[in-house]
Interface confidence: low
């Protein structure tokens, strides 16, 4: 179980690197973040570490109320702060693993 979670964490972070470059990856991450109401791997600040993402920007799927461009110069109060690895991991533990 821990190995699966570790793999998921690594994979999620790897996909984050590809987010601005790959449409398929973007759609998967957008869907995960929107559906699980989470942002980034550990938390939303992970997006700051992606070199090809603009500064002060998270994907719009991080927003509590998703609108086009809501992730640009975001307000911390308007985005999901919980990380996806923990949130989706909890769901996986409960429902799958």
């Amino acid at each position: 179980r821990d190995k699966v979670m570790s793999e998921f964490n690594n994979n999620f972070r790897q996909q984050m690197e590809n987010y601005p470059k790959n449409n398929h990856t973007a759609s998967i991450l957008d869907r995960m973040q929107a559906d699980f109401k989470c942002c980034g791997a550990a938390n939303y600040t992970d997006w700051e570490k992606i070199p090809s993402m603009s500064k002060n920007r998270v994907p719009d799927s991080c927003c509590i109320n998703v609108t086009v461009g809501c992730g640009i110069n975001f307000n911390e109060k308007a985005i999901h702060k919980e990380g996806c690895v923990e949130k989706i991991g909890g769901w996986l533990r409960k429902n799958v693993l």
């Epitope: 790959n22 559906d35 998703v66």
Partner: antibody
Framework: QVQLVESGGGLVKPGGSLRLSCAAS????????MNWIRQAPGKGLEWITY????????YYADSVKGRFIISRDNTKNSVHLQMNSLRAEDTAVYYC????????????WGQGTTVTVSS | DIQMTQSPSSLSASVGDRVTITCRAS??????LNWYQQKPGKAPKLLIY???SLQSGVPSRFSGSGSGTDFTLTISSLQPEDFATYYC??????????FGQGTRLEIK
């Protein structure tokens, strides 16, 4: 205001080629994916292709794969559709459509340009 | 590919009526369902996105609901300008982006 304006439609013979263009204004063009969607006379909407905001990812419907090519020029705020080996069934109104990529609907449509393929 | 099926294909109604159009996906699409309105000779216009969110500028008499495979578009009180063709579209699994076949709403 936010606007998409298509051009380049017209009458062409089967097997011929046509290049459609779409000029965007009123928004940061390079932030958006762009689609071409068509509508044959009296029929419903058919998605045919899209291109991602950077221009390096393109997808096509099976009905046009290998014949149509989508491209964009972010410096000129424009997207193009090169249509080759045209068939009668390609006759339709072609719409240029903005896609926020967030999978929440295509929010801005051009007025459409008519393509007629007939001998 | 995900198929989208709308019903009915056409319907007649009067001004003031409450109208419901349904859309069914061939597999679960969560809430990734959008509704468009198209008037003759005009481009489609986005009404509802993410199954139930009203697009900016769209009157509140339009509403959407559903998730999974079954969705509805409701017009609470039909106005003369609402007579048009309505399309649903899934954005869950793309490409391809797929639309329903359309529902034509006519004046009774």
């Amino acid at each position: 205001q936010v606007q998409l304006v298509e051009s380049g439609g017209g009458l062409v013979k089967p097997g011929g080629s046509l290049r459609l263009s779409c000029a965007a204004s009123g928004f940061t063009f390079s932030d958006y994916y762009m689609n071409w969607i068509r509508q044959a006379p009296g029929k419903g909407l058919e998605w045919i292709t899209y291109i991602n905001n950077g221009g390096y990812t393109k997808y096509y419907a099976d009905s046009v794969k290998g014949r149509f090519i989508i491209s964009r020029d972010n410096t000129k705020n424009s997207v193009h559709l090169q249509m080759n080996s045209l068939r009668a069934e390609d006759t339709a109104v072609y719409y240029c459509v903005r896609d926020p990529r967030m999978y929440y609907g295509m929010d801005v449509w051009g007025q459409g340009t008519t393509v007629t393929v007939s001998s | 590919d995900i198929q989208m099926t709308q019903s009915p294909s056409s319907l007649s109604a009067s001004v003031g009526d409450r109208v419901t159009i349904t859309c069914r996906a061939s597999q679960s699409i969560s809430s990734y369902l959008n509704w468009y309105q198209q008037k003759p000779g005009k481009a489609p216009k986005l009404l509802i996105y993410a199954a139930s969110s009203l697009q900016s500028g769209v009157p509140s008499r339009f509403s959407g609901s559903g998730s999974g495979t079954d969705f509805t578009l409701t017009i609470s009180s039909l106005q003369p300008e609402d007579f048009a063709t309505y399309y649903c579209q899934q954005s869950y699994s793309t490409p391809p982006i797929t639309f329903g076949q359309g529902t034509r709403l006519e004046i009774k």
